[in-house]
């Protein structure tokens, strides 16, 4: 792999990851709990991640082709030195599927990422069964192992689980929030030799990366933050009670002093920033109903104002190996009929305060075409459609059939696979097309199949207009319109003349215009005009009409 | 050893189009989330466009706001090639697009793999 140029000015074909914000390093994983009903927000299990003893880094394996749990679990041991990888250390890329993650270790940062290899080690550890995101949002790794900020130092010395616990039934919600250590821009990593007489650490540096998780009480609206630490600390002005700081409003900043007879002054000033009301953000399904059947939509909407930064709040979706981090996700292609699901997790300063995991059936989608198996005409005014069915659900057909420019459709009953055509035109070309239909959440037609057939000839209609006049003593002029109805592939006008009983002439025109010469004077005759389609004769149209006396 | 060629780039007027292919080695390409992102010039990476998988369906893709409706991603698996067909082009799509193994985002930059990229420039 060559190298590429990284938004960040890395040269690296495995582009290390950057911090969203300057927020200290994630030394913890959340698991997210797998959805089991149609929709449950806010709904989460809390879970350990257990670390192989050998490695600072566990990865999930990849639980099928999709990764739906393919996140690093990634954290921290508190006892092992971490493990900075070298060039052996490069990711061999899997054979199989990808584990893509959100975030990665503290531990697997790299001093110097070489360009053309990758930045992290990927250690296989323990399976999750449910995704994991982690709690933070960044992915620690950069060009130099930076840990903290206000502190000097080294790795923590527990790692905790940051979970929010919650049963929606129940009346609290847990948020979380980190506060993790950073020591002033050294890269220095301590080891696990004790010294044979410890002096007590300060608070500040005992308590520096403590983390908290803050319980929501939905009747109250108040948050109580709960203090991950092993012993019962005291607090100043007594604001906490058995390691927990109650009735914090949202939205708004509280300062603790963590003190603790395990250590010296100065004390650990922390400084909780409350999320907002887990209960102001509801996931909602934004797919539009004529796409419902291939799309999905999900959007986190603010049912109620809060005062907190929205600038501070992000958003981040996991459907199957697709990750996200917006607000609003649109998916195309999806099947038809099929149940998909999307994990959402809220963060606060890059902290995850709730989540909600999203099962959504797509709608019906339109349905196949049917096969027709024939369609044809076996008389003048009649013919015969039969079809297979589509595969797909469907509730009804729709068979139109159309002459000319005129269209005619009938509503049919999805259980029939043939119909008779009635009151048809005679020699006429009918186009057939026959779709099924289902309403869903709007009507969606399947393709249509079509077919066409010719109907039989049948006797054609009577000429019109006809007239007879004389253009001399003894030749007479006989003209007649075309019949409405000719009923066959040919054109033929015929004119009988008789004189009594008897049959004097017998003409055949492409035209409906006879020139009849030479008859008696003084006689009646009678004009017999009719339209001949090749196959049936029609209706004779009469008129009588006498010669005249000779004038001369 | 993953390896990620882009192609097609180059440059087109306003209102034409372009197909940027990526040929993919090194892994399982059917079973990878592959992506689509590009950089114009003094600006941070921008994920265009997404092809994955969810709930068993392959194929399932997403786009960024402002290519949708214009941009569409496609995958061969039996080619192993990535594709972006790009139509409708406006200026502002002017950027060096890249190939990337996985889902392209600042949040996961530590598990994607990024090919070279290739110039797309929109000018008339």
């Known amino acids: 792999q060559s190298p590429t140029p990284s938004p960040t000015g890395l040269t690296t074909a495995k582009m290390p990851s950057v911090p969203l914000s300057s927020d200290p390093l994630p030394t913890h994983t959340t698991a997210f709990s797998p959805a089991s009903t149609f929709e449950r927000e806010n709904d989460f299990s809390e879970t350990t991640t257990s670390l192989s003893p050998d490695n600072t880094s566990t990865q999930v394996s990849p639980d099928s082709l999709d990764n739906a749990s393919a996140f690093n679990t990634t954290g921290v041991s508190s006892v092992q030195t971490p493990h900075l990888p070298t060039h052996a250390d490069s990711q061999t890329p899997s054979a199989g599927t990808d584990t893509q993650t959100f975030s990665g270790s503290a531990a697997n940062a790299k001093l110097n990422p070489t360009p053309g290899s990758n930045a992290i080690s990927d250690v296989p550890g323990e399976r999750s069964t449910a995704s994991t995101f982690p709690t933070d949002p960044v992915s620690p790794l950069t060009t130099t192992l930076s840990l903290a900020h206000h502190s000097s130092a080294a790795l923590p010395a527990r790692t905790s689980n940051t979970t929010i616990t919650a049963n929606t039934s129940d009346a609290y919600l847990n948020a979380s929030e980190t506060t993790t250590l950073s020591p002033s821009g050294s890269a220095v990593i301590s080891t696990t030799t004790i010294a044979t007489t410890p002096s007590k650490p300060t608070c500040d540096e005992k308590y520096a990366n403590i983390t908290v998780d803050y319980l929501y009480n939905k009747e109250t609206k108040l948050f109580t933050a709960k203090l991950n630490v092993n012993e019962n600390v005291e607090c100043g002005n007594n604001t906490c009670t058995n390691n927990e700081v109650h009735n914090l409003t949202e939205c708004k900043n509280a300062s603790v002093s963590i003190s603790h007879n395990s250590c010296t002054a100065p004390d650990k000033t922390l400084i909780l920033d409350v999320p907002p009301g887990v209960e102001k953000f509801q996931l909602h399904d934004c797919t539009q109903v004529e796409k419902a059947d291939t799309t999905i939509c999900l959007k986190w909407k603010n049912i109620e104002t809060f005062t907190c930064d929205t600038q501070n709040i992000t958003y981040r979706f996991q459907c199957g190996n697709m990750i996200f981090d917006n607000k609003e996700i649109k998916l195309e292609n999806l099947e038809p009929e099929h149940e998909y699901k999307c994990d959402s997790e809220i963060l606060y300063n890059n902290h995850k305060f709730t989540n909600a995991s999203k099962i959504i059936k797509t709608d019906f989608g339109s349905p196949g075409e049917p096969q027709i198996i024939f369609c044809r005409s076996e008389a003048a005014h009649q013919g015969v459609i039969t079809w297979n069915p589509p595969q797909r659900s469907f509730h009804n057909f729709t068979l139109c059939y159309i002459k000319e420019t005129e269209k005619d459709c009938l509503n049919l009953d999805k259980n029939l696979i043939k119909y008779d055509l009635q009151n048809l035109k005679p020699y006429t070309k009918y186009v057939l097309s026959l779709h099924a239909y289902i309403i869903a959440k709007v009507q969606r037609n399947g393709s249509a199949a079509m077919c066409h057939f010719t109907t039989k000839s049948a006797p054609p209609s009577q000429v019109w207009n006809m007239t007879v006049s004389m253009t001399s003593d003894n030749s007479m002029h006989v003209k007649c319109r075309p019949p409405r109805d000719r009923n066959g592939p040919h054109e033929r006008y015929h004119l009988e003349v008789e004189a009594g009983n008897t049959l004097v002439r017998n003409e055949s025109h492409k035209n409906c215009d006879f020139r009849v010469k030479d008859l008696q004077y003084s006689t009646d005759y009678t004009f017999k005009a009719y339209f001949h389609n090749g196959d049936y004769p029609g209706e004779p149209f009469i008129l009588h009409h006498s010669t005249s006396y000779n004038s001369k | 050893e993953v390896q990620l060629e882009e192609s097609g780039g180059g440059l087109v007027q306003p209102g034409g189009s372009l197909r940027l292919s990526c040929a993919a080695s090194?892994?399982?390409?059917?079973?990878?989330?592959m992506s689509w992102v590009r950089q114009a010039p003094g600006k941070g990476p921008e994920r265009v466009s997404i092809?994955?998988?969810?709930?068993?369906?392959?194929?399932?893709?997403s786009y960024a706001d402002s290519v949708k409706g214009r941009f569409t991603i496609t995958r061969d698996n039996a080619r192993s090639t990535l594709h972006l067909q790009m139509n409708s082009l406006k200026p502002e799509d002017t950027a060096v697009y890249y190939c990337?193994?996985?889902?392209?985002?600042?949040?996961?930059?530590?598990?994607?793999?990024w090919g070279q990229g290739t110039q797309v420039t929109v000018s008339s």
């Open positions: 990337v193994k996985g889902n392209g985002l600042t949040s996961t930059r530590a598990s994607d793999y």
């Open positions: 092809i994955g998988s969810v709930g068993g369906t392959s194929g399932v893709t």
């Open positions: 090194g892994f399982t390409f059917s079973n990878s989330v």
